[in-house]
């Protein structure tokens, strides 16, 4: 699987999950989250050659098409597969609230 | 929705489904399919700016991150959302067989 275990410990050039830290204030302009100040969101990057973690029958077809037509703009794209939630603390006035924001962290990628 | 109805009738620059015809022999090297000779597979293409048909909470965050950091390589990607099957005819010896190939045609796209 193109997950953090594999991708973070390799120099994989093809589609893989990459490290990305997002600071809520600086990168998103969000002031309302108190904790954490930011988080490791990660992102997916890398080419999707034929056979590389292809998501559907269509992805396989498109990767094969791309192999036969290298100049074509039609190609599968490296996108998130497994996402995880992020627990946050925000304040309603002086009162702290804990919330789980779903689908915030990329754990693995796929070619779609 | 970024579907064929909208995308094929507009000059949309952002993520949208685009027309693509695939010839089984020429583009894939598949000789085993008898009918059709090819099909309108379509493909997804176009930038994914903030708010543009974003798939998950993560996609929203990443698009917002990209807006604050325009030079970053981390950005959502335009990929298939709705896929449809393709009925094909192939031969086993002299006997024709009809088969549905699932997830072969892109009907709509999303930013993931």
């Amino acid at each position: 699987a193109l997950d953090t275990n594999y991708c973070f410990s390799s120099t994989e050039k093809n589609c893989c999950v990459r490290q990305l830290y997002i600071d809520f204030r600086k990168d998103l302009g969000w002031k309302w989250i108190h904790e954490p100040k930011g988080y490791h969101a990660n992102f997916c990057l890398g080419p999707c050659p034929y056979i590389w973690s292809l998501d559907t029958q269509y992805s396989k077809v498109l990767a094969l098409y791309n192999q036969h037509n290298p100049g074509a703009s039609a190609a599968p794209c490296c996108v998130p597969q497994a996402l995880e939630p992020l627990p946050i603390v925000y304040y309603v006035g002086r009162k702290p609230k804990v919330e789980q924001l779903s689908n915030m962290i990329v754990r693995s990628c796929k070619c779609s | 929705a970024l579907d064929t109805n909208y995308c094929f009738s507009s000059t949309e620059k952002n993520c949208c489904v685009r027309q693509l015809y695939i010839d089984f022999r020429k583009d894939l090297g598949w000789k085993w399919i008898h009918e059709p000779k090819g099909y309108h597979a379509n493909f997804c293409l176009g930038p994914c700016p903030y708010i543009w048909s974003l798939d998950t909470q993560y996609s929203k965050v990443l698009a917002l991150y990209n807006q604050h950091n325009p030079g970053a390589s981390a950005a959502p990607c335009c990929v298939p959302q709705a896929l449809e099957p393709l009925p094909i005819v192939y031969y086993v010896g002299r006997k024709p067989k009809v088969e549905q190939l699932s997830n072969m045609i892109v009907r709509s796209c999303k930013c993931s």
Partner: antibody, heavy 120, light 108 residues
Framework: QVQLVQSGAEVKKPGSSVKVSCKAS????????ISWVRQAPGQGLEWMGG????????YYAQRFKGRVTITADESTSTTYMELSSLRSEDTAVYYC?????????????WGQGTLVTVSS | ETVLTQSPGTLSLSPGERATLSCRAS???????LAWYQQKPGQAPRLLIY???SRAPGIPDRFSGSGSGTDFTLTISRLEPEDFAVYYC?????????FGQGTRLEIK
């Protein structure tokens, strides 16, 4: 510049519902928090609740809970405030306002207001 | 809920004079959870001061805010003709947000 443009005046019957919209432009909608405040004719200001658009977390003043629903549609940068079981005392100008960034906060940009009249 | 009491209810002054508006909270707000607004007839409120003493962007420096705990003050050092309006204080320390009943500043 930042603008919050609200939907037009409404006349409603007691017992019915009203949905007021507030469309934002000139800033990143989802980086902000939107509050709703109302003002009865000749009266003071009363906070109803608010929403964090990007995560759709809504919160309400206790006295409006169960009667008000605040939602956000990111694709159109629009916030909505729906008030149900209307009574004559709900006749007021309804304002949306963006906060300085926190959930409960001062409000720096305001819509032009929407007059809702409840009358039989 | 936190009740805010503004005084006086009406303040009659002449242009050029100094105006002092008071806002008292029924419980302590700390030092940074109070805002002041100006409202003119037929218009939405306009933020003047937030965090008890910080001026909002574009607000003239004749407006200043002070105070902490339960007692807060808005001061307009030298009244201009356009300053005559209704002024509201607002607390955002606790839910629900509450506003004072307003002080009407009128021309004497």
């Amino acid at each position: 510049q930042v603008q919050l443009v609200q939907s037009g005046a409404e006349v409603k019957k007691p017992g019915s519902s009203v949905k007021v919209s507030c469309k934002a432009s000139g800033y990143t909608f989802s980086s902000n928090v939107i509050s709703w405040v109302r003002q009865a004719p000749g009266q003071g200001l009363e906070w109803m609740g608010g929403v964090i658009p990007i995560v759709d977390i809504a919160y309400y003043a206790q006295r409006f809970k169960g009667r008000v629903t605040i939602t956000a549609d990111e694709s159109t940068s629009t916030t909505y405030m729906e008030l149900s079981s209307l009574r004559s005392e709900d006749t007021a100008v309804y304002y949306c306002a963006s906060t300085l960034g926190l959930v409960l906060d001062a409000m720096d940009y305001w819509g032009q207001g929407t007059l809702v009249t409840v009358s039989s | 809920e936190t009740v805010l009491t503004q005084s006086p209810g009406t303040l009659s002054l002449s242009p050029g004079e100094r105006a002092t508006l008071s806002c008292r909270a029924s419980q302590s707000l700390g030092s940074s959870y109070l805002a002041w607004y100006q409202q003119k007839p037929g218009q939405a409120p306009r933020l003047l001061i937030y965090g008890a003493s910080s001026r909002a962007p574009g607000i003239p420096d004749r407006f200043s805010g002070s105070g902490s705990g339960t007692d807060f003050t808005l001061t307009i050092s030298r009244l201009e003709p356009e300053d005559f309006a209704v002024y509201y204080c607002q607390q955002y320390a606790d839910s629900p947000i509450t506003f004072g009943q307003g002080t009407r500043l009128e021309i004497k």
